[in-house]
């Protein structure tokens, strides 16, 4: 079958397709938007139907352009919309890692900095860059291993290799080896030179004179250096410090250069010696907003705002028509952030406050009149050849300084212009044309050719020299780059490629690695060549002092929890403990809480009372009532600790007052009287003629009531007084002090009364005797 011949009429390529011949056949090359033999069908893949990074392919389905999707791993379906169960589906990568499918069942995690492991689950041991001095860190189990460069060794490549300890020695021909951090240095004998003293020393070959110094041999192994200005030393290695007696003003810092010095000025000053005030208005063109005028001041600037604006930088809008009075019948139109005065004829200025000087046509014909918006005066813009306030004066071009006529042509002034009378051999309006020796372009490298009478002169571009400007000046000849910088000769300039740690046009500045304040938490930064060191404040560690030392590890708190601080810790003690480390058990027994002789035992944040028999309660404060069973038959029960005491009623005795005293036992009845025992007494049955209680007395002495506080008993020729409680004496007239026997127990206070006593008991005790 014959392929389409798109060059034939009726078979041309549609929709911008191009007909191209290849291998003897013609075919339509379609643009991206159309497909098919004649580019007749819209490209079905243009709408990106395949989702989830599936690839769309154009297929022919019975002559109609269709598409088919090749799905990315993990997806299926005609549009790649169906997610297959795969290893990345549940995002197994931890700590912000990104999951990449390798196969349906295998994945690889791209871990963020600081994490490693198949699923980013391990903190990366190399994240803190532990290997110093360019050592390569390799994670190993839960730690790391450092592969050190040849000049360093040790677990973190911080130990310098002593190259001078090698056998045989590195420095040859009797040279002395000096070990340095990361390298070594050979100090050679006068007869040899080279990094390892391997070459015989020939004075001035190569020249040891640095910084462009010229070498002159003065003997077999001696030389002399003639230094360029600004350098000194045996080999011109010292840049003379030009800073003593410098003229840097206003706090400028002197920076030594080669045979000169520069002043590093504070922000508000500039100029060679920091004497010129920095013009902030020039530095910040938008310092004053909304058309405000910037006025520089020493160490600052002021804004003069246009009407309608206010504020330090003229950013605040004012309702201008409220405060602005337009002059002389002008109409005020309020605008956003401004106002506009519509002036009547003959007036001008922002407020129509000026007379318009242009009304009177003060400028000469052909010039342009503008009104000065500040003072209303006319400003005439003159055409070429005229000058003066009204552009009415002719400019004498012949007396403006340089003769406008070249090659000594004579200048003749005319009204508004000038003419040149040329010397023989020259022509042109300004005598600029002569016989042109520059036609052959003799000047190279973009030089300017000056045609002269019978000759030419080449004015070279900067960086070139020679009659035809054919020689490129070597600006590197003077070795201007410091600190081993590499000099690249350019056209009319040079460029220094500085070693790491140095910068500046001449590599003259040591880069201050401390400028970015890498040291954290108040650490001091020590700058060095191409490095810095952080001296940490107390309580911090790490390369940048970023790690707060955990003073809680190991835990210093015995009986409590530890709270870490900066260079300190605080122990929050468990109840019952005290001390800086919670090491002291508080003795809760020190307040003697156990009463009635109870024994105290200290516990954690508590105590325990072991009570004596007869007492109870947490503090043994309760005395058990031994009188509860009423043990005293005929008497009052006094409760004691683990016991009681019976105070017997008169006439009774025994520990329980259950024995009636036999008052007849002593035969108290005289003169043959019969004794009858009673309670707390007896009765005598007297024989006739005797009558007193003991049958002694015929006369009753009790009739006169001699017993003041008691009962009278008549006796033979006398009487006896039985006193009321609390009284004593022959006649019961003496008030007894019942407190003398200390009847109040358990610390109770005794108060003597007329008849008896009263006990005031301590807290927790009661009863007549506080028992």
């Amino acid at each position: 079958a014959r392929g389409p011949r798109c060059s034939q009429p009726g078979e041309t390529c549609l929709n911008g397709g191009k007909c191209e011949a290849a291998n003897g056949t013609e075919a339509c090359v379609c643009g991206g938007a159309f497909v098919g033999p004649r580019c007749q069908d819209p490209n079905p893949c243009l709408s990106t139907p395949c989702k989830n990074a599936g690839t769309c392919h154009v297929v022919d389905r019975r002559g109609v352009a269709d598409y088919a999707c090749s799905c990315a791993l993990g997806f299926s379906g005609p549009l790649c919309l169906t997610p297959l169960d795969n290893a990345c589906l549940t995002n197994p990568c931890r700590n912000g890692g990104t999951c990449d499918l390798l196969t349906l069942t295998e994945y690889k995690c791209r871990c963020p900095p600081g994490w490693s492991g198949k699923s980013c689950q391990q903190a990366d041991p190399c994240a803190s860059n532990p290997c110093a001095n360019g050592g390569q860190c390799l994670p190993f189990e839960a730690s790391y291993i450092c592969h050190c460069p040849p000049s360093f060794h040790g677990p973190t490549c911080r130990q310098d290799v002593n190259e001078c300890g090698q056998k045989p020695g590195l420095c040859r021909h009797g040279g002395t080896c000096h070990n340095e951090v990361g390298s070594y240095r050979c100090v050679c004998r006068a007869t040899h030179t080279g990094p390892n003293c391997e070459r015989p020393y020939v004075p001035c070959s190569p020249s040891p004179c640095q910084n462009g110094g010229t070498c002159r041999p003065t003997g077999d192994v001696t030389h002399e250096c003639a230094c360029l200005p600004g350098f000194t030393g045996q080999n011109c290695e010292e840049n003379i410090d030009d800073c003593p007696g410098n003229n840097c003003k206003n706090g400028g810092a002197c920076v030594d250069g080669v045979n000169t010095y520069n002043c590093r000025c504070p922000p508000e000053w500039t100029g060679q010696y920091c004497t010129e005030d920095v013009d902030e208005c020039q530095l910040m063109p938008n310092a004053c907003q909304n058309g405000g005028t910037c006025h520089n001041t020493h160490g600052g600037y002021n804004c003069v705002c246009v009407n309608g604006w206010t504020g330090e930088d003229c950013s605040e809008n004012i309702d201008d028509c409220a405060s602005a009075a337009c002059f002389h019948g002008a109409t005020c139109h309020d605008r956003v952030a401004s106002f506009y005065c519509e002036c009547p004829h003959g007036r001008t200025g922002l407020l129509c406050h000026l007379n318009d000087a242009c009304i009177s046509n003060p400028c000469n014909e052909g010039s342009n009149c503008d009104t000065n918006p500040v003072n209303g005066k006319a400003i005439c813009t003159c055409p070429s050849g005229y000058t003066g306030p009204a552009c009415s004066q002719d400019v004498d071009e012949c007396s403006l300084g340089a003769n406008p006529c070249e090659h000594a042509g004579k200048c003749i002034n005319t009204l508004g212009s000038f003419e040149c009378q040329c010397l023989q051999g020259y022509t042109g309006p300004r005598c600029e044309i002569d016989v042109n020796e520059c036609v052959s372009n003799p000047c190279q490298n973009d030089a300017t050719c000056l045609d002269q009478i019978g000759e030419f002169q080449c004015i070279c571009m900067p960086g070139y020299e020679g009659v035809h400007c054919e020689v490129n000046t070597d600006e590197c000849a003077s070795s201007p780059c410091l600190h081993n910088g590499r000099c690249l000769d350019k056209i009319n300039e040079f460029q220094c490629e500085c070693p790491t740690g140095f910068t500046g046009h001449l590599c003259q500045y040591d880069v201050d690695e401390c400028a970015s304040t890498p040291c954290k938490n108040g650490a001091k930064c020590l700058d060095g060549p191409n490095t810095y060191t952080c001296v940490c404040t107390e309580g911090y560690t790490g390369t940048h002092c970023e790690v707060d030392i955990d003073e809680c590890d190991p835990d210093p708190c015995h009986y409590g929890s530890c709270k870490d601080g900066v260079a300190t810790f605080t122990c929050l003690c468990r109840p019952g403990y005290t001390g800086h480390h919670c090491e002291t058990n508080i003795n809760e027994c020190s307040s003697q809480p156990c009463r009635h002789g109870g024994t105290c035992q200290d516990r954690d944040n508590a105590y325990l009372c072991f009570c004596l028999k007869g007492t109870t309660g947490p503090n043994c404060e309760i005395n058990l009532d031994d009188c509860a069973s009423s043990p005293c038959d005929s008497g009052t029960c006094l409760d004691k600790i683990d016991g009681y005491e019976c105070a017997c009623e008169p006439g009774y005795t025994g520990s329980m007052c259950n024995i009636n005293i036999d008052e007849c036992a002593g035969n108290p009845c005289h003169n043959g009287g019969t004794c009858e025992d009673g309670i707390n007494g007896f009765t005598c049955r007297c024989p006739e003629g005797y009558h007193d209680p003991t049958c002694l007395s015929e006369v009753n002495e009790c009739n006169s009531n001699p017993c003041v506080h008691g009962a009278c008993r008549d006796s033979l020729n006398g009487y006896k007084c039985d006193c009321d409680p609390g009284w004593s004496g022959t006649n019961c007239d003496i008030n007894n002090n019942e407190c003398e026997s200390n009847p109040c127990v358990n610390g109770g206070t005794c108060k003597d009364m007329t008849s008896g006593y009263v006990c005031t008991c301590r807290e927790g005790f009661s009863g007549p005797n506080c028992q």
Partner: nanobody
């Protein structure tokens, strides 16, 4: 190879409940995200639910509100509690293990769940 023991698959009526369980060895279980996938006849295998080592869960839209996944770390077992079952839930249910230390996905042998009246 990872050893997984699945159980709990059965024939159940629509609206009924089932609990599937999957036991793994202690070393695999403690370092793996566990879960369940299913494959209905003539369809691709799809994720049903998953639970991370620290207990965060993920459910397919079809499982939300009806199914619950939880893991018993003491028994090294993951469970799928299935409620309000529908005929559409009929499939072979596979225990799935993503081994975080090896970076690999493993499936069990599968247990048949049939929802039919």
């Amino acid at each position: 190879e990872v050893q997984l023991v699945e159980s709990g698959g059965d024939l159940v009526q629509p609206g009924g409940s089932l609990r599937l369980s999957c036991a793994a060895s202690a070393t695999v279980f403690s370092n793996s995200d566990m879960g369940w996938s299913r494959q209905a006849p003539g369809k691709e295998r799809e994720l049903v639910a998953s639970i991370t080592t620290d207990g965060n869960t993920l459910y397919a839209d079809a499982a939300k509100g009806r199914f619950a996944i939880y893991r018993d770390n003491s028994k090294n077992t993951v469970y799928l509690e299935m409620n309000s079952l529908k005929p559409d839930d009929t499939a072979v249910y596979y225990c799935r293990v993503v081994d975080l230390l090896r970076g690999k996905l493993y499936w069990g042998q599968g247990t048949q769940v049939t929802v039919s009246s």
